[in-house]
Interface confidence: low
């Protein structure tokens, strides 16, 4: 009679992670009599997944019955494969021996592939806020992939971008992958309602990428631009000053009027309007009494926001008897007016 | 070889950088590691640069530390330094083009951080 | 994120005899595990990589083992130029990644 041949006649099985695997055996023969053992690997160090004779292999069912003398098929089922399960596999084939079973013949081998999903990709931008012009990195992570293939896509608000690079973790063998990849971006001043997406593509999410976003809200800061102005005269003696606050986010803000260098008043950005962009206006006012001064009173409107140093911008009032209409101020920050705007 | 430069005694709060200067080796080939030991404690990684010029980092070590290359040199810069930061300074090669394997390792440069 | 555990923390060896040093990880990291040798004042060195492959230049004397989550280095034949602090660290991945490192092992050679 023809000698026993072990039959394996999948050299390689794909399975997805959580899934059951299903490893095919069969011998040729009846004889000799003796037991079945599947191994993961070859060798002295090979890891047994199951055994005919002895023993409790929660996770494997056989697919037969094995107990039945007639039996020739000796495939198993894996329930619950997670990418750890991954390697070749061995249905042996043992001869009857006293006082231990001998190794008779081996299968040729079953390579188990697990392919599992990437995690959500998690996007984190930088640690702090940054001005428009500026690049700014966001990272993107996922995890516990496998294949190893898995492409990698940023996008800003719909368009792609190309400035990123991208490593995937390890760069040899390994039952799962991570990948991590870092991507540049250009700060403008209408980023406020922006997002960053990253997209992960595998073959296990059927052409469904996974996205992680980012809001560029978290990220950007849009300094305010300052500008003070001097309403016509409301009483004899008074004048009103108004210092517009325009395009700032976030709305994290302090002005502070000062009379000649002398803080007058501090208050906070409350009641503010929200621009279409998503950034912020504001406007405070201040009510000088004229005949409180007999020299002239250079007013100063320093704002504060987001914790940044302080910008300024200053208009300068003259006393005198007759009142006249008065313009604005447009002189750069930090500096008084080169227009002397005259009461 | 690798040799760390640029450790001395700095007060809290000043920026200090440290640079890798490497030969014999091309930094298109292989990522590059910064590692530090505190007196008497044991080795904390830092982070990597890829060979594109790429960075990872510890979870601790993300906003505090700034790596950056040129094609001989890779430089970490520690941007606020408290007392905690002072340490030996390890500049380390990676065995590939990638994250792995520590292979060539630099004498190390001590930062001293006090008032 | 993946955490590396040595044991013991110190542990004392006699000329000639064997010391072995565990280290576990908290993930499956198959065999992308390595050791290092570092003695005072000196920089860390490269004495096996892939959990068990010894690098150039490094004494038969040491051995790696393990894979998955649980690794071994033991040092037999141990001689006084021993004497070192010795570390594990997982070459699998960086990702959230707080140390790459065990926390270390001083052997001390009596």
């Known amino acids: 009679e023809e000698e026993l041949q072990v039959i394996q006649p999948d050299k390689s099985v794909l399975v997805a992670a959580g899934e059951t695997a299903t490893l095919r055996c069969t011998a040729t023969s009846l004889i000799p009599v003796g037991p079945i053992q599947w191994f993961r690997g070859a060798g002295p160090g090979r890891e047994l997944i199951y055994n005919q004779k002895e023993g409790h292999f929660p996770r494997v069912t056989t697919v037969s019955d094995l107990t039945k003398r007639n039996n020739m098929d000796f495939s198993i089922r894996i329930g619950n494969i997670t990418p750890a399960d991954a390697g070749t596999y061995y249905c042996v084939k043992f001869r009857k021996g006293s006082p231990d079973d001998v190794e008779f013949k081996s299968g040729a081998g079953t390579e188990l592939s697990v392919r599992a999903k990437p995690s959500a990709p998690v996007v984190s931008g930088p640690a702090a806020r940054a001005t428009p012009q500026h690049t700014v990195s966001f990272t993107c992570e996922s995890h516990g992939f496998s294949p190893r293939d898995i492409t990698l896509k940023w996008f800003k608000n719909g368009n792609e971008l190309s400035d990123f690079q991208t490593n995937v973790d390890p760069v040899g063998e390994s039952v799962s992958y991570s990948i991590h990849s870092t991507a540049k971006v250009v700060l403008t001043r209408e980023d406020v309602h922006s997002q960053v997406i990253c997209e992960v593509a595998h073959v296990t999410l059927q052409g469904d990428p996974l996205r992680g976003t980012a809001n560029l809200s978290e990220t950007i800061r849009v300094p305010p631009t300052l500008e003070v102005t001097q309403q016509p005269v409301r009483a004899e003696n008074q004048v009103n000053v108004t210092c517009q606050v325009r395009k700032f986010y976030p709305q994290r803000l302090q002005l502070t009027w000062l009379e000649n260098g002398n803080v007058s008043r501090t208050e906070t950005a409350s009641t503010v309007t929200e621009n279409k962009d998503g950034t912020y206006n504001w406007m405070s006012w201040l009510l000088v009494n004229v005949s409180a001064h007999r020299d002239d009173v250079k007013l100063t409107c320093q704002v504060e926001h987001d914790g940044q140093p302080a910008v300024s911008k200053s208009h300068d009032l003259k006393v005198s008897a007759h009142p006249k209409e008065q313009g604005s101020n447009t002189a750069a920050e930090n500096t008084g007016s080169n227009e002397r705007n005259i009461y | 070889s690798v040799e760390e430069s640029g450790g001395r005694l700095v007060t809290p709060g000043t920026p200090l950088t440290l640079t890798c200067t490497v030969s014999g080796f091309s930094l298109s080939n292989y990522a590059m590691h910064w590692v530090r030991q505190a007196p008497g404690k044991g080795l904390e990684w830092i982070g990597i640069?890829?060979?594109?010029?790429a960075t990872s980092y510890a979870t601790w070590a993300k906003g505090q530390f700034t790596i950056s290359k040129t094609s001989t040199t890779v430089d970490l810069k520690i941007t606020s330094p408290t007392t905690e930061d002072t340490a030996t300074y390890f500049c380390?090669?990676?065995?590939?083009?990638?994250?792995?394997?520590?292979?060539?390792w630099g004498p190390g440069t001590l930062v001293t951080v006090s008032l | 994120q993946i955490v590396m555990t040595q044991t013991p923390f110190s542990v004392s060896a006699v000329v000639g005899g064997t010391v072995t040093i565990k280290c576990q990880a908290s993930?499956?990291?198959?065999?992308?595990l390595a050791w290092y040798q570092q003695k005072p004042g000196q920089r860390p060195k490269l004495l096996i990589y892939?959990?068990?492959t010894l690098a150039s230049g490094v004494s038969s004397r040491f051995k790696g083992s393990g894979s998955g989550t649980e690794f071994t280095l033991t040092i037999s034949g141990v001689e006084s130029a021993d004497a070192a602090t010795y570390y594990c660290q997982q070459g699998y991945g960086i990702s959230y990644v707080h140390n790459v490192f065990g926390g270390g092992t001083e052997v001390v050679v009596k």
């Open positions: 993930h499956n990291i198959g065999s992308w």
């Open positions: 640069i890829y060979t594109g010029g």
């Open positions: 892939d959990a068990s």
């Open positions: 380390a090669r990676g065995d590939r083009d990638g994250y792995a394997y520590f292979n060539i």
